[in-house]
């Protein structure tokens, strides 16, 4: 903590400007009014303060707002956000998507820090659900965001938000997460026609039950092997050879290369050899 000293004559800062970069830490503490700093936070980000100087400015804001910063200050924190601890952020009430974007921008290109995770958690809890605009914003900054949520947290995602999800946002999701997301996606895309529906639902199919896979097999979807390999084993096992052939279309030949991997291996073992032979791929049950 910076020791309290009187501000030297003529050093009192009338505004937050670039000359403050030359102020020693004790001078910043003594000569910069905290209320002035709060009202001119938008200027701080344009001034190349050292990290130690930023510590002093943070300390001044902490003293001014012991219960947590108001959103008018939070929105303009800029690089000062990197100085905040998760404990600081838990005191905030962030409701504006613009504020969230401004702070995520500061951390852009870096891994999701504990500060960012806390900020997102506070924001989403404040909104009550992961609405489409929020999800759009979060996945734009952190493509893996959705898959970092627990199935319980994902259950608060409304089906309308699923439109914001891109295939790459689901790359790291496990089956438990897809089990939660798939029914929401099915609901969200239900009014689309066959081929368009399949394009949208494809990346969620790791959560699809057997009956939905059977229905898809009747629609000439030509599922690729990469998608097939991500299907739930328990959903694939009851499918007949004919259904898998229809589901994969021309991609059925790819089963041979995957015959030793799940779910293909387990599915092959469940089929009659006569049925497998109809594929002409040399699969051995």
């Amino acid at each position: 903590e910076v020791e309290k000293t009187a501000c030297p004559s003529g050093k009192k800062a009338p505004e937050i400007d670039e000359s403050l970069i030359f102020y020693k830490k004790w001078e910043l503490e003594a000569c910069v009014d905290a209320a002035l700093l709060a009202t001119q936070m938008d200027r701080v980000n344009a001034i190349p303060f050292t990290y130690e100087q930023l510590d002093v400015l943070k300390h001044k804001l902490d003293e001014l707002y012991p219960q947590g910063y108001p959103e008018s200050v939070i929105q303009h924190l800029g690089y000062l956000f990197l100085k905040m601890s998760p404990e600081d952020i838990r005191k905030w009430n962030v409701t504006s998507l613009e504020t969230l974007k401004a702070l995520l921008e500061v951390n852009k290109g870096h891994e999701m820090s504990p500060q960012v995770a806390t900020l997102i958690d506070r924001f989403v809890k404040g909104r009550g659900q992961l609405d489409k605009d929020t999800l759009d914003t979060l996945t734009a900054f952190y493509p893996g965001y959705l898959c970092s949520l627990s199935p319980e947290e994902l259950s608060s995602v409304p089906p309308s938000s699923i439109w914001a999800v891109r295939p790459q946002d689901l790359d790291t999701c496990d089956p438990r997460q897809l089990d939660v997301l798939y029914p929401k996606a099915r609901l969200a895309f239900q009014n689309m026609n066959g081929s368009e529906y399949f394009v949208k639902i494809q990346s969620f199919l790791g959560g699809a039950p057997t009956e939905d896979l059977k229905a898809l097999s009747q629609q000439n979807v030509s599922m690729d092997l990469a998608t097939f390999m991500k299907l739930r084993t328990d959903a694939v096992l009851p499918l007949t050879v004919a259904e898998v052939q229809k589901l994969l279309g021309p991609h059925v030949e790819g089963l041979k290369a995957e015959e030793r991997h799940r779910p293909v291996r387990d599915w092959i073992l469940r089929q009659r050899q006569d049925d497998l032979d109809t594929l002409g791929l040399g699969l051995q049950g």
Epitope: E18, S19, T50, E52, Q53
Partner: nanobody, 127 residues
Framework: EVQVVESGGGLVQAGASLRLSCASS????????MAWFRQAPGKERELVAG???????YYSDSVKGRFTISRDNAKNTVYLQMDSLKFEDTAVYFC?????????????????????WGQGTQVTVSS
């Protein structure tokens, strides 16, 4: 790479004036800060005056009202006009330029923040 060269030092009587010049080359845009530091024998290097890329100025308490820092953009030169010189102003004066993108150091009054330094020019004030 920025090159910084000071000139204008010398021996003067107390109460007289001197103007130091600091010519920088090797870049087209202004550094974040240009500053004049001084170091008296047996003492630490201390900030005398600073100038930001936007033209804002800063002076240490000991020279405020007597020294003026300015620059001529066309000549890529920063000046330190020193009036009413005192015996205690005797020191080697260094010009420094800094960009410090990673923002380390305690503040821009700390010499550790500056990457580029001149070789120094001696100012001696006799009483």
């Amino acid at each position: 790479e920025v090159q910084v060269v000071e000139s204008g030092g010398g021996l003067v009587q107390a109460g007289a004036s001197l103007r130091l010049s600091c010519a920088s080359s090797g870049r087209t845009i202004s550094p974040i800060a240009m500053a004049w530091f001084r170091q008296a024998p047996g003492k630490e290097r201390e900030l005398v005056a600073g100038l930001t890329w936007t033209g804002r100025t800063y002076y240490s308490d000991s020279v405020k009202g007597r020294f003026t820092i300015s620059r001529d953009n066309a000549k890529n030169t920063v000046y330190l006009q020193m009036d009413s010189l005192k015996f205690e102003d005797t020191a080697v004066y260094f010009c420094a330029a800094g960009d410090n993108p990673d923002r380390r150091g305690s503040s821009w009054s700390s010499s550790s923040v500056y990457e580029y330094w001149g070789q120094g020019t001696q100012v001696t004030v006799s009483s």
